[in-house]
């Protein structure tokens, strides 16, 4: 393990659509992936008239958007489905929404992340 980084080996699992997807509804998911690649946890949810409905929680493959995030926080402004990812065992047990101020989209595609 690399010092200062929390490795993700398992995440909270939840699937609201478990019957259709033929999975368990809830539990703990061991995270698998290519050797040397990082692993993360994620949570997705909807906000239906102020009521939070969890859609899915589980393991997420190596993603630079999730690096060094110990907390699962959605920063996009009013997405249709909220998504957050994080590093560390079961880090997706809690999740939150803190939208960043949106900057006007540049005329060409940014390769770097959109600035806050």
């Amino acid at each position: 393990a690399i010092l200062g980084r929390s490795e993700t080996q398992e995440c909270l699992f939840f699937n609201a659509n478990w019957e259709k997807d033929r999975t368990n509804q809830t539990g703990v998911e061991p995270c698998y992936g290519d050797k040397d690649k990082r692993r993360h946890c994620f949570a997705t949810w909807k906000n239906i008239s102020g009521s939070i409905e969890i859609v899915k929680q589980g393991c997420w493959l190596d993603d630079i958007n999730c690096y060094d995030r110990t907390d699962c926080v959605e920063k996009k402004d009013s997405p249709e489905v909220y998504f957050c990812c994080c590093e560390g065992n079961m880090c997706n047990e809690k999740f939150s929404y803190f939208p960043e101020m949106e900057v006007t989209q540049p005329t060409s595609n940014p390769v770097t992340p959109k600035p806050p």
């Epitope: 698998y32 290519d34 690649k37 994620f42 997705t44 859609v55 899915k56 589980g58 393991c59 997420w60 493959l61 190596d62 993603d63 630079i64 958007n65 996009k76 997405p79 249709e80 489905v81 909220y82 998504f83 595609n109 940014p110 390769v111 770097t112 992340p113 959109k114």
Partner: antibody, heavy 115, light 111 residues
Framework: QVQLVQSGAEVKKPGASVKVSCKAS????????INWVRQAPGQGLEWMGT????????SYAQKFQGRVTMTRDTSISTAYMELSRLRSDDTAVYYC????????WGQGTLVTVSS | QSALTQPASVSGSPGQSITISCTGT?????????VNWYQQHPGKAPKLMIY???KQQSGVSNRFSGSKSGNTASLTISGLQAEDEADYYC???????????FGGGTKLTVL
């Protein structure tokens, strides 16, 4: 093992639409992104866009904005890329690839646009 | 975002080492360790060789290595073999807040 299997070759007329599918197996489909890339005959790779397989959130290259739609059906672990208002210069092999690193690729789908 | 810049072609003899460059800007290649390298044989799908500038994809020969200096990423192939003859592309991570872009590709000829 991880596999992405794409739908078969298509021949379309200018102005029509095409929908290419990409069926994933060997990993949890909802654990990453699916990216779409195309390659015109004798040309390089061109990124079209990406879809978050669990949330359905998409990002499209500006060039394709308004003409491309990426969707997925998590119950059958399949991603879709639909390109509308086809032109002859859309003739290309279209690839899907797993994750932001493009670590596994589909075999490609040849789309020919010809009148 | 304009494509990353690669040489159109490079060549080398069996056993030699070759390096392919991929030049971007201070806001993409220069700022982040997220450049990848792909190998593509004619009529085949691309294959990830190096990701995150210098990490080897599982199952890839250790003759392939990646590095970065300033705004330029490089792929080095040592002990060149006939089967290394292919097109090589650099590209960036794409997903979430990141948009993808590829280099124009480099044709490697093994003499």
């Amino acid at each position: 093992q991880v596999q992405l299997v794409q739908s078969g070759a298509e021949v379309k007329k200018p102005g029509a639409s095409v929908k290419v599918s990409c069926k994933a197996s060997g990993y949890t489909f909802t654990s990453s992104y699916i990216n779409w890339v195309r390659q015109a005959p004798g040309q390089g790779l061109e990124w079209m866009g990406t879809i978050n397989a669990v949330s359905g959130s998409t990002s499209y290259a500006q060039k394709f904005q308004g003409r491309v739609t990426m969707t997925r059906d998590t119950s059958i672990s399949t991603a879709y890329m639909e390109l509308s208002r086809l032109r002859s210069d859309d003739t290309a092999v279209y690839y899907c690839a797993r994750s932001g690193w493009f670590d596994y690729w589909g075999q490609g789908t040849l789309v020919t646009v010809s009148s | 975002q304009s494509a990353l810049t690669q040489p159109a072609s490079v060549s080398g003899s069996p056993g030699q080492s070759i390096t392919i460059s991929c030049t971007g800007t201070s806001s993409d290649v220069g700022s982040y360790n997220y450049v990848n390298w792909y190998q593509q044989h004619p009529g085949k799908a691309p294959k990830l060789m190096i990701y995150g500038v210098s990490k080897q994809q599982s199952g890839v020969s250790n003759r392939f290595s990646g590095s970065k200096s300033g705004n330029t990423a490089s792929l080095t192939i040592s002990g060149l073999q006939a089967e290394d003859e292919a097109d090589y592309y650099c590209g960036t991570f794409a997903g979430g807040s990141y948009y993808g872009v590829f280099g124009g590709g480099t044709k490697l000829t093994v003499l």
